[in-house]
């Protein structure tokens, strides 16, 4: 006994088989890549009359894959799922088993088809083996049950009730048909679901409709100084076995950032990082920095913590500023000899302007290189000077200088000259070192002084007294120098003049 060729399949393949196809042979169907198999993949060659072979079931079909297909949860009263789980996509299968004392009619497996329906056959049914049946259940207002199209129900079957959107089930959700032919409970009812009033909303208010049925919206508003954190409205929705409001906002306090600091001034009031809405800060300027100068507040002295369009804490305006009232102060153009101004050159010098000086090459700056125009219109400190050291003062013949062994001769240094006894100073006795590094006036000279004789003469050279030697003396013809006498002369320090004598 053998079977004929297996039924063909569009967009699919049949596993290899050889002919004749003997009873007991299993052939398998499969689909091409983009197609899904709907139906049993295996066919068995059987015989019912022991004469001819026949295939035990129709061939499956291959459907073009529909990624959008989705089938509903299949329910078989008196049965349960033994294969398959949600979500059900195109080509997924579900297999059912019947509960004890129920027998199955139809195929135990169905497939999710491209049209979102279960197939290729209808869902199986599980039929009770008991004769007693429960009466048909009533429909419930605003709800449904799983046996709406069934006349009477066999013992062991369960009926599940559900309510339409916006209604809640009151009573038993599942009632069972007992073997006595009675229902295990009375049918439930569907009551309109109502949310509880939201009541007090901290730091704000809530506007809700008079009847709080499912689907209505409550709107939230915050008190001044608070802003909504979260959704501005909440909906009454079904949640599990009850109703609830969707996520509600909170009113959070609005804060301003720390008040902005100002130069030459300060604020009184709040200086925290977070300043509460409505807080006020007052700005004042620092005390007068010096006599004749004071700070003037320009702008609003008071700022308030307010909100912007985004409900963000912001100050009511910009911070004021503290400006010096020194517009009348003017300093003269600063001057420096043998130097130049290296920064701060201007046509006009006003309060707090500064200039910096430098000296010409070879000159040294004496004083502060930087000076400032003060409130009195004078430069502070006074302008520096550029000066040069003098060379050591020259020595003079027949005289000496009083330099106390100095090695440096800064401008302003004064040196005194004096002449030896018997000599007189011609010129100024003191010279000064000028800023240009030059001695002034010219160095004096020591000239031979005339002797104002005292009338005292010595024949021997005095010891420890100044004696001006006679260097120019000469004798007339027929005479020669011989010996000396010493004539005392008047002076600050008495001194002696040598007089040479001539003899024949």
């Amino acid at each position: 006994i053998s079977c004929g060729s297996p039924p063909p399949i569009l967009n699919g393949r049949i596993s290899y088989y050889s002919t004749p196809i003997a009873v007991g042979t299993v052939i398998r169907y499969s689909c091409s890549g983009t197609f899904r198999l709907i139906g049993e993949k295996s066919l068995l060659c059987i015989t019912k009359d022991k004469v001819d072979g026949t295939w035990d079931k129709p061939a499956p079909k291959c459907e073009y894959f529909n990624k959008y297909s989705s089938c509903p949860e299949p329910i078989v009263p008196g049965g349960y799922k033994i294969r398959g789980s949600t979500p059900y996509r195109h080509g997924d299968s579900v297999t059912f088993a019947c509960k004890t004392n129920f027998s199955m009619n139809g195929n135990k497996s169905v497939w999710c088809q491209a049209n979102n329906m279960w197939g290729p056959t209808r869902l199986p049914t599980c039929v009770s083996v008991f004769p007693l049946e429960c009466p048909a259940l009533p429909m419930i207002h605003n709800g449904h049950h799983t046996s709406e199209n069934v006349g009477s129900i066999a013992p062991g079957l369960s009926v599940t009730y559900s309510c339409e959107s916006g209604y809640l089930l009151v009573g038993e959700k599942i009632i069972n048909c007992l073997s006595s032919g009675k229902w295990s409970a009375v049918p439930p009812t569907c009551e309109e679901a109502r949310c509880k009033s939201l009541g007090r909303f901290p730091n704000g208010k809530v506007k809700e409709p008079p009847i709080l049925r499912v689907g209505v919206t409550a709107n939230f508003f915050c008190d001044e100084g608070y802003r909504l954190q979260g959704p501005p409205s909440s909906r009454c929705v079904i949640a599990g076995q009850g109703v609830a409001w969707t996520k509600m906002p909170v009113c959070e306090e609005i804060f301003c950032p720390s008040p902005p600091p100002i130069l030459n001034g300060r604020h009184i009031g709040n200086s925290l990082a977070n300043v509460s809405y409505g807080s006020i800060v007052t700005y004042t300027c620092d005390p007068d920095p010096e006599e004749g100068v004071n700070f003037i507040l320009i702008g609003e002295s008071t700022l308030r913590c307010t909100v912007d369009s985004q409900k963000t804490g912001t100050w009511s305006g910009p911070a004021p500023r503290c400006e010096l009232s020194t517009s009348a102060v003017q300093c003269p153009h600063p001057q420096i000899l043998r130097g130049r101004m290296v920064s701060g050159q201007k046509d006009r010098y006003t309060y707090n302007d500064t200039v910096i000086f430098a000296c010409m090459f070879g000159f040294t700056l004496k004083g502060s290189k930087q000076i400032r125009c003060n409130a009195q219109g004078t430069w502070e400190p006074s302008a520096p000077v550029c000066e040069k050291e003098c060379q050591a003062p020259p020595n003079i013949l027949n005289g000496q200088k009083e330099d106390r062994h100095m090695v440096r001769f800064d401008p302003g240094t004064s040196i005194k000259y004096s002449c030896n006894p018997g000599y007189v100073l011609v010129g100024e006795e003191s010279i000064q070192c000028t800023s240009e590094g030059v001695w002034t006036p010219p160095v004096p000279q020591c000239k031979v002084a005339a002797c104002e004789a005292t009338g005292r003469q010595l024949l021997t050279k005095p010891q420890h007294q100044f004696v001006r030697p006679d260097v120019n003396s000469s004798c007339g013809e027929g005479y020669k120098l011989s010996g000396s006498v010493y004539q005392e002369c008047q002076g600050t320090i008495p001194w002696f003049m040598e007089i040479r004598l001539c003899k024949e």
Epitope: Y80, K81, I82, A97, C98, K99, S103
Partner: antibody, heavy 117, light 105 residues
Framework: EVHLQQSGAELVKPGSSVKISCKAS????????MHWIKQQPGNGLEWIGW????????EYNQKFNGKASLTADKSSSTAYMQLSSLTSEDSAVYFC??????????WGQGVMVTVSS | EIVLTQSPTTMTASPGEKVTITCRVS?????MHWYQQKPDASPKPWIY???KLASGVPDRFSGSGSGTSYSLTINNMEAEDAATYYC????????FGSGTKLEIK
């Protein structure tokens, strides 16, 4: 009355295979699903898979694909489970169970399989 | 797969005490079944379809829950109730909880 009688304890070597049986009585063998469940010593329960003896249809827990193979003999109302490539991890008690009403309402007494060299 | 988390893992109760075992589910299921197992014995069906007592189960036992949270309650603990209880869900692959070992004081 429904009764599920399982075969005796097995001591097997690593790498080998073992086939254990579950003889059913008291109900229509071909119309009910037979499940197999694993319980390691001191451990919980793990579902291996089922067989529908009426047409030989099977469903496995992916974890046991290639490890367990379920078959049934309608003539003797016996379900079988073959475990292959055995390791110490396969040492456990294996139960057959019937799901008459959508839960495991009848259980076999269990078979202890010990994998040891 | 759906993971069932039972708590507590072990517990000790005095006779007459009320005992509750919970089973949390990683994603919503329609029903929960419970089994009782005593040492060296096969598990027995105890509560099926969340709240129905299996044949021969004393009425001090009850089951409740929905979605992702289920529980088994013993209203008046007795010595014979000492056992390990497993929850089990019927979405494929079928999975069991890790068990709660209940001991008598």
């Amino acid at each position: 009355e429904v009764h599920l009688q399982q075969s005796g304890a097995e001591l097997v070597k690593p790498g080998s295979s073992v086939k254990i049986s579950c003889k059913a009585s008291g109900y229509t063998f071909t119309s009910n699903f037979m499940h197999w469940i694993k319980q390691q010593p001191g451990n919980g329960l793990e579902w291996i898979g089922w067989i529908y003896p009426g047409d030989g249809d099977t469903e496995y827990n992916q974890k046991f694909n290639g490890k367990a193979s379920l078959t049934a003999d309608k003539s003797s109302s016996t379900a079988y489970m073959q475990l292959s490539s055995l390791t110490s991890e396969d040492s456990a008690v294996y139960f057959c169970a019937l799901s008459g009403d959508g839960y495991f309402d009848y259980w076999g007494q269990g078979v202890m399989v010990t994998v040891s060299s | 797969e759906i993971v069932l988390t039972q708590s507590p893992t072990t517990m000790t109760a005095s006779p007459g005490e009320k005992v509750t075992i919970t089973c949390r589910v990683s994603s919503s299921v329609s029903y929960m079944h419970w089994y009782q197992q005593k040492p060296d014995a096969s598990p027995k069906p105890w509560i099926y379809e969340t709240s129905k007592l299996a044949s021969g189960v004393p009425d001090r036992f009850s089951g409740s829950g929905s979605g992702t949270s289920y529980s088994l309650t013993i209203n008046n603990m007795e010595a014979e109730d000492a056992a390990t209880y497993y929850c089990q869900q019927w979405n494929f692959p079928l999975t069991f909880g890790s068990g709660t070992k209940l001991e008598i004081k």
